[in-house]
């Protein structure tokens, strides 16, 4: 098992300047580590590519809400 304490931290140094279509997004994770220069959200797209985004932007918050709801909704 990897040592979580020593696991490498992905930091965001720039944020995307684009609003990403929510249909292209699969998941997200928050970056809050003190080792990073700024708080961020990293979206993972449906083709497993990662994008740094600014958690203060409304579209980012809306996208996280949408993904949260998708996760909570059971597949029938």
């Amino acid at each position: 098992q990897p040592d979580a304490i020593n696991a490498p931290v992905t930091c965001c140094y720039n944020f995307t300047n684009r609003k990403i279509s929510v249909q292209r997004l699969a998941s997200y994770r928050r970056i809050t580590s003190s080792k990073c220069p700024k708080e961020a959200v990293i979206f993972k797209t449906i083709v497993a590519k990662e994008i740094c985004a600014d958690p203060k932007q409304k579209w980012v918050q809306d996208s996280m809400d949408h993904l949260d709801k998708q996760t909570q909704t059971p597949k029938t």
Epitope: T10, C12, Y13, N14, T16, N17, R18, K19, I20, S21, Q23, R24, I42, K49, E50, I51, C52
Partner: antibody
Framework: EVQLVQSGGGLVQPGGSLRLSCAAS????????MSWVRQAPGKGLEWLAN????????YYVDSVKGRFTISRDNAKNSLYLQMNSLRAEDTAVYFC???????????????WGRGTLVTVSS | AIQLTQSPSSLSASVGDRVILICRAS??????LAWYQQKPGKAPKLLIY???SLESGVPSRFSGSGSGPDFTLTISSLQPEDFATYFC?????????FGGGTKVEIK
Amino acid sequence: EVQLVQSGGGLVQPGGSLRLSCAASGFTFSHYWMSWVRQAPGKGLEWLANIEQDGSEKYYVDSVKGRFTISRDNAKNSLYLQMNSLRAEDTAVYFCARDLEGLHGDGYFDLWGRGTLVTVSS
Amino acid sequence: AIQLTQSPSSLSASVGDRVILICRASQGVSSALAWYQQKPGKAPKLLIYDASSLESGVPSRFSGSGSGPDFTLTISSLQPEDFATYFCQQFNSYPLTFGGGTKVEIK
């Protein structure tokens, strides 16, 4: 099949105009930024312009600003490049490309058209 | 505009060789760098994005590294189908720019 099919190239006189088209299929065109890139014969690649998903935001390289216009029609899954006041130095193969966001920046290309040759000559 | 300088402009190598291509940026581009392979008469093909991420479907013999100003593309064991021209591209800022390319030829 995910692809970009280009049309509209050809021979045009200096000062003339031409419109290039790029038809997308196999993916949801309206979810992506799109770009045009060109390559002069035997030379490197030059990014020209890109356009946001709904067409509201556009960026151009200085060498074509004011002469070329990028546009799109999401209902037709099509991207366009209107080229006016053409010069001999615009002679190149023109590629359309799907334009993605990276971890620390925006604008690399994971899907390309096959290219169309534009020759500007009298 | 950010200028990208690729070196060497061309190189000769044999099948099985380890090949290292260099792309130097005139100013910081973080890890916003991509590498493409282009064969004559064809469109470029994406190999690497975010400086070191391998595009889906690209053989693992290709790898990228660096975080500016120097980036490298390494081909661990050159295959016959790898003889082509390779371009780097920065997407840190507009205008998006490409390097001049490195042509990998058969020795």
